[in-house]
């Protein structure tokens, strides 16, 4: 399974997507601040087989498409870019599914490591109640919208790990 | 890796203005935050405000509000604190500041060497 | 606004010396306080954010505490180049502003 140069394209285009879908200033929302407990040690990528990283990756791809794809976020931010977003993401997450089927063949895919699965889950169950919370209020959609920039730039820099891999 | 570099030291007339600019480097430019903090001769730091320049609006201390002008130009990576009215307090070495990219303005890791901008008639 | 106050303004030490500098808001700023050290005709460099973690590069002889409305900066062992001026500044909310700043002089 190679990751190749266009799957790096494709997470830089989502990265820069998330930054132009910012629709009030980040200097604004400070005292929204939140600590959502991203959970690093599964993007570190040592401890990892390829195929696990991967299905990781996986994760935290689809409940950002899910996280996104909700109609209080569709409320929140401008349509055209979602769509694109949308389609990018996409995009990875059949690079990613290709390439766990490729690592480790159809059959042992639904077993890879449910804990690293389970704690981006949970992550992202945070990150849900936190906006529940604060009823979807543009300060706290910015405080998600740039903490999954964040926890994307961890895949982003997971993805390049296993790229050098190969 | 990051460099802010500055420009030149000004010398200017009360009431006339100044403008300052601030090219970076390293990074994506547009999605992180570029703050201006001055320091008066002997004296601490004061936050002017901030810009992130993918979102193009300025965010402004009370104190310069009307004053300053906070801009950013993506094409040059190119950020510029313009300061109106100028007085005789405004005497100051002015930096700017870079904020942590993908992470929300609070900290200023990384700052330009700083612009002396007198003001004396 | 929200106002920072250190103390002391100036102290006097010696390589080797324990230093403490300590930083008060006027109101709960939670954790958000960042450590600054200054020297003469430089910028600013981070030290300390959140107020207790370590900004990388930075030696462990550098410390942070704190929460709420009271935070100290402590440098364990005072080396010669520590000599400067330190400053606080809250992040909690803006306008973003710091302390007046402690001059660390040599003995």
């Known amino acids: 399974c190679n990751l190749s140069q266009t799957h790096s394209l494709n997470n830089r285009r989502t990265l820069m997507l998330m930054a132009q879908m910012r629709r009030i200033s980040p200097f604004s929302c400070l005292k929204d601040r939140h600590d959502f407990e991203f959970p690093q040690e599964e993007f570190d990528g040592n401890q990892f087989q390829k195929a696990q990283a991967i299905s990781v990756l996986h994760e935290m791809m689809q409940q950002t498409f899910n996280l996104f794809s909700t109609k209080n976020s569709s409320a929140a931010w401008d349509e055209t870019l979602l769509e694109k977003f949308y389609i990018e993401l996409f995009q990875q997450m059949n690079d990613l599914e290709a390439c766990v089927i490729q690592e480790v063949g159809v059959e042992e895919t639904p077993l890879m490591n449910e804990d690293s699965i389970l704690a981006v889950k949970k992550y992202f169950q945070r990150i849900t109640l936190y906006l529940m919370e604060k009823k979807y209020s543009p300060c706290a959609w910015e405080v998600v919208r740039a903490e999954i920039m964040r926890s994307l730039s961890f895949s982003t820099n997971l993805q390049k790990r296993l790229r050098r891999k190969d | 890796q990051v460099q802010l570099v500055q420009s030149g030291a000004e010398v200017k007339k009360p009431g006339s203005s100044v403008k300052v600019s601030c090219k970076a480097s390293?990074?994506?430019?547009?999605?992180?935050?570029i703050s201006w903090v001055r320091q008066a001769p002997g004296q601490g730091l004061e936050w002017m405000g901030g810009?992130?320049?993918?979102?193009?609006?300025?965010n402004y201390a009370q104190k310069f509000q009307g004053r300053v002008t906070i801009t950013a130009d993506e094409s040059t990576s190119t950020a510029y604190m313009e300061l109106s009215s100028l007085r005789s307090e405004d005497t100051a070495v002015y930096y700017c500041?870079?904020?942590?990219?993908?992470?929300?303005?609070?900290?200023?890791?990384?700052w330009g060497q700083g612009t002396l901008v007198t003001v004396s008639s | 606004d929200i106002q920072m106050t250190q103390s002391p303004s100036s102290l006097s030490a010696s390589v080797g010396d324990r230093v403490t500098i300590t930083c008060r808001a006027s109101q709960s700023i939670s954790s958000y306080l960042n450590w600054y050290q200054q020297k003469p005709g430089k910028a600013p460099k981070l030290l300390i954010y959140f107020a207790s973690s370590l900004q990388s590069g930075v030696p462990s002889r550098f410390s942070g505490s704190g929460s709420g409305t009271d935070f100290t900066l402590t440098i364990s062992s005072l080396q010669p180049e520590d000599f400067a001026t330190y400053y606080c500044?809250?992040?909690?909310?803006?306008?973003?502003?710091f302390g007046q700043g402690t001059k660390v002089e040599i003995k």
């Open positions: 500041a870079r904020h942590l990219e993908y992470a929300f303005p609070d900290k200023f890791d990384y």
């Open positions: 810009i992130i320049p993918i979102f193009g609006t300025a």
């Open positions: 500044q809250q992040s909690y909310s803006t306008p973003l502003t």
């Open positions: 390293g990074g994506t430019f547009s999605s992180y935050a």
